[in-house]
Interface confidence: low
Amino acid sequence: KESTPDVQGQFPCDFSWGVTESVLKPESVASSPQFSDPHLYVWNATGNRLLHRVEGVRLKTRPAQCTDFVNIKKQLEMLARMKVTHYRFALDWASVLPTGNLSAVNRQALRYYRCVVSEGLKLGISAMVTLYYPTHAHLGLPEPLLHADGWLNPSTAEAFQAYAGLCFQELGDLVKLWITINEPNRLSDIYNRSGNDTYGAAHNLLVAHALAWRLYDRQFRPSQRGAVSLSLHADWAEPANPYADSHWRAAERFLQFEIAWFAEPLFKTGDYPAAMREYIASKHRRGLSSSALPRLTEAERRLLKGTVDFCALNHFTTRFVMHEQLAGSRYDSDRDIQFLQDITRLSSPTRLAVIPWGVRKLLRWVRRNYGDMDIYITASGIDDQALEDDRLRKYYLGKYLQEVLKAYLIDKVRIKGYYAFKLAEEKSKPRFGFFTSDFKAKSSIQFYNKVISSRGFPFENSSSRCSQTQENTECTVCLFLVQKKPL
C-alpha cells in the first residue's frame, strides 16, 4: 500500500535533527576592525567619504573573535531558533584553494569555516560538512581545474584528495560527519554533451570520493574518529501506469541509473550496476547509442569498494516514469525514460510532487539492495511561495517525517538522521528556506521545533526526555577543543 495511517512513536535519542545549507561563502575579513585596530576614525560623510584617522587617540583592542563575522552571527541566530542538533553546510572549494592545489591556501576562509563549526558547537549544534557542493549554475571548482577540463580530467580527483586532506587536517578535530561530494549523480545535468562525458566525469567523481575516504581512513580516522560518505540525489520512482510491465521496468531502471550508478561501486561491488552496463551495451549493439560505461580495473574496483561509513541520501520527491525508447548518445536518452507530471498530486510551485510514502519505499529499497547500514537523509524539503505561513512546507515535513518514522519503527531501517532543506533561501531562487533571504522566520520553524523536541510523534503520555548519555555524543571532546585550540 502507498499511504498507511500515521503512526505514533519516537526516533531514537541519538537521532540527528538537522538543517542543510548549500555553499557558505566565507567572509574575507571579520567585519569589526575596531576591535583589532587601536585607532579612532571619523568619516567624512559629505566630502571624500573616506575615514580619517584621529591622531593621538588610542582605543582598547581585543583579539578577533568568531562572532566578529557578521554572517556567522546571522547563521547562529537562525540555527538557535531552529533547535536542531546538526547543521549541514558546504565549504567553497574555490575559496579555500583558489589555485586548485596546496600552493595557495586561503587561511582566512578556513578560519571562517572553523568559526562556523566552533560557534555552532557552543550552541550544542554539531556540523556535517560537505567538501564539494556543485550547483548547476556553477561547478564550484577552482578556476585552474575548471579550465583543465574539470571532472573530465582524472587529475581533478587527485586535486580533490589534496583539498579533502587539508580540510580534514584543519577542521577534523571538530567535525565528525563529512560528506565528500553532494549529488555527484546529478552532474549529468552539466556534463551532458555526450553519455561518455557524463560517465567519464562520474568515474572521476567516484575516484575522487574514494581517494578522500581512503585518505581519511588511513591518516585521520585513528585520531579523529569521524565518518565519511557522499550524498546521492535519491528521488523515488514509481511506474506512471502500475498495470504496465514496461513502466515497472522503467522505474527500476531509473533507480539503477540514478542511485545504483554510484551506490553499487561504493557500497557493494566496486563496479557499476550490471543492469545499467547491460542496458547501455544493448542500446550500443542496436546502434541507438554510442555510450559506454568505463571498464574498471581490479585496482579501481578495490579502490572504490567499501568507501562509505554511512549512506547519505537527498530525497525530495517521487517521479512517475514510463518507458520510451530514445535514440541519441546521452545519459538522458540512454535511460529510455519519460517523466509524467501527475496534475492530480499536491505539488509545489516548481512542480515537485508531495509523495510522502516515496521516502519509505526508497529506504526499504536501499536496505534491500545494499544491506543494513546507517542511513542519513541529508537533504529533504520543498519550495513554498509563502513568506510567513508556509503551510505546504509544514505539511511536507510532517508527512515525510511520518514515513521516515514508519521506516524506523516498522521496517527497522537504521535511520540515523533527517536534515531539512534548507536554512535560508536565496534571492531569485525557489523558496526552499525556513528563513527568507532577509532572515525573516517562517512558521514551519515552530512546527519543526515541536517535532524535534518531541523526537517525532509520541503517544500522549510518553516522555521525550533523553539522558545525556543517550543523546548524540559524536563530538564530546569538540567543545573542549573549541575552548583550547586557537581559532
Partner: antibody, heavy 120, light 111 residues
C-alpha cells in the same frame, strides 16, 4: 605496468650513512604510500616506515626513528631512504613496497631489494 | 606493538597435500569490519609476493589453491593442493595500527 626499481648494492663503513633509492613507474606516484622493509639473513621482515608522496607525510616504526629518513622527489617519481650511523646490525636487504590504494595497507608491488653491507 | 606469532616455524608437506599455517596476533587486528592481516610468500633472492589481503581476499594472479581465513586474533593460510613451486617462506603481516609488523615466517618444504 607498475614497477619499483631500486638502486644497486652498497658497501659502507661503520658510522657512515647511505641513501638508497626506489624509482616508481607505471602509476601516479603521488597517490600511494611507499613503504620500506628490512630483511636480514636468516631473520624475518621488519617494517621501517612509509612516506606518502602526495603530501610528503611520513610514519616510522619507533625502532627506526633517528636511523632512517624517508623522502620523495615527485618530479622524478623516486622515493629515498637514508640510513645513518651505520653498524653491522644495519647490514640487510632493504625493500621498497607500494601500498595498494591505502585501504588495505597491504604491499602489492615490491622493488627487487638493495643489499647494504656494513663492513670496515 | 602487535606481535604476530606464526606456527609452525617449519612445515614439511607432500605434493598434493594440504599445508596449514597459523598466525596469532597479540591483540585484535580487526576494525570497522575489516581484518587488517595479509599473507606473503618469499623465495630466496626475491622480494615477498602478496598472496592474501584483508585476511581472506585472494590477490589477483594468485592461484586459487591459496586461501585465507580468520578474524580478530587468529588467522590461517591454507594451500591445497601443494605444488612444487610453493616451497618458500610465508609471512603474515598486519596493518591494523602502527607499527605494521610481520610474523616470524614459516618455511614450507616439499617432502
Amino acid at each position: 605496468q607498475v614497477q619499483l626499481q631500486q638502486s644497486g648494492p652498497e658497501l659502507v663503513k661503520p658510522g657512515a650513512l647511505v641513501k638508497i633509492s626506489c624509482k616508481a613507474s607505471g602509476y601516479t606516484f603521488t597517490r600511494y604510500d611507499i613503504n620500506w622493509v628490512k630483511k636480514r639473513p636468516g631473520q624475518g621482515l621488519e617494517w621501517i616506515g612509509w612516506i606518502y608522496p602526495g603530501d610528503d607525510s611520513t610514519k616510522y616504526n619507533e625502532k627506526f626513528k633517528g636511523k632512517a629518513t624517508l623522502t620523495a622527489d615527485k618530479s622524478s617519481s623516486t622515493a629515498y631512504m637514508q640510513l645513518s650511523s651505520l653498524t653491522s646490525e644495519n647490514s640487510a636487504v632493504y625493500f621498497c613496497a607500494r601500498s595498494d590504494y591505502y585501504g588495505s595497507r597491504s604491499f602489492v608491488y615490491w622493488g627487487q631489494g638493495t643489499l647494504v653491507t656494513v663492513s670496515a | 606493538d602487535i606481535v604476530l606469532t606464526q606456527s609452525p616455524a617449519s612445515l614439511p608437506v607432500s605434493l598434493g597435500q594440504r599445508a596449514t599455517i597459523s598466525c596469532r596476533a597479540s591483540k585484535s587486528v580487526s576494525t570497522s569490519g575489516y581484518s587488517y592481516l595479509h599473507w606473503y610468500q618469499q623465495k630466496p633472492g626475491q622480494p615477498p609476493k602478496l598472496l592474501i589481503y584483508l585476511a581472506s581476499n585472494l590477490e589477483s594472479g594468485v592461484p586459487a589453491r591459496f586461501s585465507g581465513s580468520g578474524s580478530g586474533t587468529d588467522f590461517t593460510l591454507n594451500i591445497h593442493p601443494v605444488e612444487e613451486e610453493d616451497a618458500a617462506t610465508y609471512y603474515c603481516q598486519h596493518s591494523g595500527e602502527l607499527p605494521y609488523t610481520f610474523g616470524g615466517g614459516t618455511k614450507l618444504e616439499i617432502k
